[in-house]
Amino acid sequence: AAPCPDACCPHGSSGLRCTRDGALDSLHHLPGAENLTELYIENQQHLQHLELRDLRGLGELRNLTIVKSGLRFVAPDAFHFTPRLSRLNLSFNALESLSWKTVQGLSLQELVLSGNPLHCSCALRWLQRWEEEGLGGVPEQKLQCHGQGPLAHMPNASCGVPTLKVQVPNASVDVGDDVLLRCQVEGRGLEQAGWILTELEQSATVMKSGGLPSLGLTLANVTSDLNRKNVTCWAENDVGRAEVSVQVNVSFPASVQLHTAVEMHHWCIPFSVDGQPAPSLRWLFNGSVLNETSFIFTEFLEPAANETVRHGCLRLNQPTHVNNGNYTLLAANPFGQASASIMAAFMDNPFEFNPEDPIPVSFSPVDTNSTSGDPVEKKDETPFGVSVAVG
């Protein structure tokens, strides 16, 4: 094949080599950029900056080598458009520093920075950590800071990410209240801070106030949907990023739903309960407290992380006609109580019997109607009624 006269020449099926002295001062308009997986650049002393726009359209890039060139600055977001990048070689350039943000979000198997006049500062604490943890092939490079000795020996006691403290209200929060959160940010070289509110959606009206070092957030007219939702304060400095998440507990009364019994490896009477704080539960069978046992018991499904509602089953492992009847679930918390009832028929009675005859079942009587109200516990009875905390 004839030698390639261009600044950049194809290399293999999806590679490009740019090695002609001084031919490039940026990476715009590289031929076949969208299909490139490998880009090798050498001897480009005019290529001094690498920025977001330079790598736009190089979405398939896996290996990037820029060596023996004039690179002085790599923007923190330079590799935003190259998420598949796994090998990055920037050796023998003029880099004094490289932000932690530059490599954030990439899964770099190899990062080569040897031969650069690195300046030891907290901004390179992340790189020092890579060296300590054996990441990206960094330890083998024995990186030096220009005139300061090995990177490994850089003092780092004062190199910390920001410290965050989020103040939330101590008092109970009710539906419709306004809630003020404050995020106190401490640390050196603070650059940016803010709130992440992606989970909130319609849970409250949001108003942000203040700036570093004290950020305010007002959640106005909160709803019960705010429960279990993360409100996150974040801050960044040259060392890295810190985040702290809090949740605001919005009190609301217990509610309960019952569904028709289903056969699911034996039987299940499905239920859903909600409330904040989490309600306690009691089951009644034909108006009497149902004592839970290993063959009739409450079992919860795994809770969703971002909601208060709990789903579960009253499990009946071997129900017969004796278990046919009216099941009531009572749920109560300090803000209210609720109940729901359902008739369940598991099996026809195989025996002839007079409906007036008593069926011997060990249940404790309870003074309540089955629509609402708190069961009254008789003091002289064995306290067998089960209370299950949901949460």
Partner: antibody, heavy 117, light 106 residues
């Protein structure tokens, strides 16, 4: 695989107490009831009680209600059975066994408790 | 309490025999469960929900019954079947076991 490993043999004097442990592994401890059953030498099986680690619910055989205490430590997936005011007729092998939707699916290897003056 | 009475209490039989053990409950139970125990060992769940064989139990074993009367049957006795068998109810507290049926080689 599921394992229920019980503590070692005990020799106790009448009037003393004994606490037998049952360490679970290979399954989600809180999802299963734990039963305690004993067997006197040459005799049948006698159910002492059951506990649900998920909420601490306990049911006892009336015969043992005032002397047996069932507890769990969820952090180490271990169930305990303590029997107080021991008598010579409490000499037996004590077993733990787990159940969820079917009865006593798996059993511990047993702990021999000897009550002798 | 629901009393369970097994019969016979002990039984001598030969390899190849068909063997039936019965369990009678003092009041109706929905299902019966059976355990096998060998000397010095913990019981093993053998038949549950009246007729379901536990994992690893040979098909020569079967269970049947309803209400108050239940049976465990071995169609053709094998040497490894010689053991003690207990019935158990799981329908009311306290859970109770039969007194056991010891199956011995004749």
């Amino acid at each position: 695989q599921v394992q229920l490993v019980q503590s070692g043999a005990e020799v106790k004097k009448p009037g003393a107490s004994v606490k037998v442990s049952c360490k679970s592994s290979g399954y989600t401890f809180t999802n299963y009831w734990m039963h305690w059953v004993r067997q006197a030498p040459g005799q049948g099986l006698e159910w002492i009680g059951e506990i649900y680690p998920n909420n601490g619910r306990v049911n006892y055989n009336e015969k043992f209600k005032n002397r047996a205490t069932l507890t769990v430590d969820i952090s180490i997936s271990t169930a305990y059975m303590e029997l107080s005011r021991l008598r010579s007729d409490d000499t037996a092998v004590y077993y733990c066994a787990r159940s969820r939707y079917d009865p006593m699916e798996d059993w511990g290897q047993g702990t021999t408790v000897t009550v002798s003056s | 309490d629901v009393q369970l009475t097994q019969s016979p209490s002990s039984l001598s039989a030969s390899v190849g025999d068909r063997v039936t053990i019965t369990c009678s409950a003092s009041s109706s139970v929905g299902y019966m469960h059976w355990y096998q125990q060998k000397p010095g060992k913990a019981p093993k769940r053998w038949i549950y929900d009246t007729s379901k064989l536990a994992s690893g139990v040979p098909s020569r074993f079967s269970g049947s019954g309803s209400g108050t009367d239940y049976t465990l049957t071995i169609s053709s006795l094998q040497p490894e079947d010689f053991a003690t068998y207990f019935c158990q109810q799981w329908s009311s507290i306290p859970l109770t076991f039969g007194q056991g049926t010891r199956l011995e080689i004749k």
